[in-house]
Amino acid sequence: LGCDLPQNHGLLSRNTLVLLHQMRRISPFLCLKDRRDFRFPQEMVKGSQLQKAHVMSVLHEMLQQIFSLFHTERSSAAWNMTLLDQLHTGLHQQLQHLETCLLQVVGEGESAGAISSPALTLRRYFQGIRVYLKEKKYSDCAWEVVRMEIMKSLFLSTNMQERLRSKDRDLGSS
């Protein structure tokens, strides 16, 4: 991928998913009525024509927003601090790496539009999540619904990254 989103980035993404899974505090079976349609922009991660700049931008904005969401007083009150610290550290490492990659991609002349457009869409999506948490008064079930939603969207974003890596491998071997 140019800067190659190396294997360890995929590994860090999977570690983030594992941490999010371990953070569960209450049984999700208690929270069915709190489900909400956050309208994750699936089209952003489902396309077959994946551009390097687009993928990196989506991943960067996703991780940035997750970091912000779980880096608040409300979040500290809701989750196990040890796991939360591990989550912050892992996200910070991934963000640093992605920032280096993004600078390189922009330097290679890929469109700035491919970078700014996903960011705006994802900010709206995460704003919806923040509004929901506030509406629900940051209840345990609201945080549980959000944790599951973040896991789903991060899983889809990580899949997009894997698809791009395998596409690059195919191009490299042909």
Epitope: H21, R24, S27, P28, F29, L30, C31, L32, K33, D34, R35, R36, D37, F38, E144, V145, M148, E149, K152, F155
Partner: antibody, heavy 121, light 107 residues
Framework: EVQLVQSGAEVKKPGESLKISCKGS????????IGWVRQMPGKGLEWMGI????????AYSPSFQGQVTISADKSISTAYLQWSSLKASDTAMYYC??????????????WGQGTLVTVSS | DIQMTQSPSSLSASVGDRVTITCRAS??????LNWYQQKPGKAPKLLIY???SLQSGVPSRFSGSGSGTDFTLTISSLQPEDFATYYC?????????FGQGTKVEIK
Amino acid sequence: EVQLVQSGAEVKKPGESLKISCKGSGYSFTSYWIGWVRQMPGKGLEWMGIIDPSDSDTAYSPSFQGQVTISADKSISTAYLQWSSLKASDTAMYYCARHPGLNWAPDFDYWGQGTLVTVSS
Amino acid sequence: DIQMTQSPSSLSASVGDRVTITCRASQSIAGFLNWYQQKPGKAPKLLIYYASSLQSGVPSRFSGSGSGTDFTLTISSLQPEDFATYYCQQSYSIPITFGQGTKVEIK
């Protein structure tokens, strides 16, 4: 293609034990819960319980609590429903179905083909 | 537990008829209601989820409405393949519960 494939029909005697299975494929098995539903001959659908295969957390209908055990083995994408001591009244068709958990998606959108359990002396 | 009551328990109709089945919950379930169709010897099939969303691949003659405690499944023009039993189901809370079913028969 998403599929839930259940184990075959069983004929058992009262007092015997039984474990039936439901194997998921074509999707991320740990991203969905698996529910079990009973249908006695000529009757309606009864929800028995549900499992989150990612950590094997379960919830049961009060009518089935203590009567059956739901489990899962995520390494082989399979959920199970078991009885330690069958009764004649357990004779029924048993279905598994996937549920999106807390994600906003259709409930029980894919079902297994059903396992017919007959308990008779 | 939330009780789900369907009416009627059975009905006779002709091809082309408009058919309406109702489902009432014993307490408010917001919009967490699903409708299933089951034919003899087959597994149930999801038709409508979240009260009014049509499941992928289901013909548009099926529609759902309602929220709170009262819900409706409508088949705008009954087709030969629609003769089956229909169930409502709430997923507002555990234990999940089904209605007793409505059998749609040929008149």
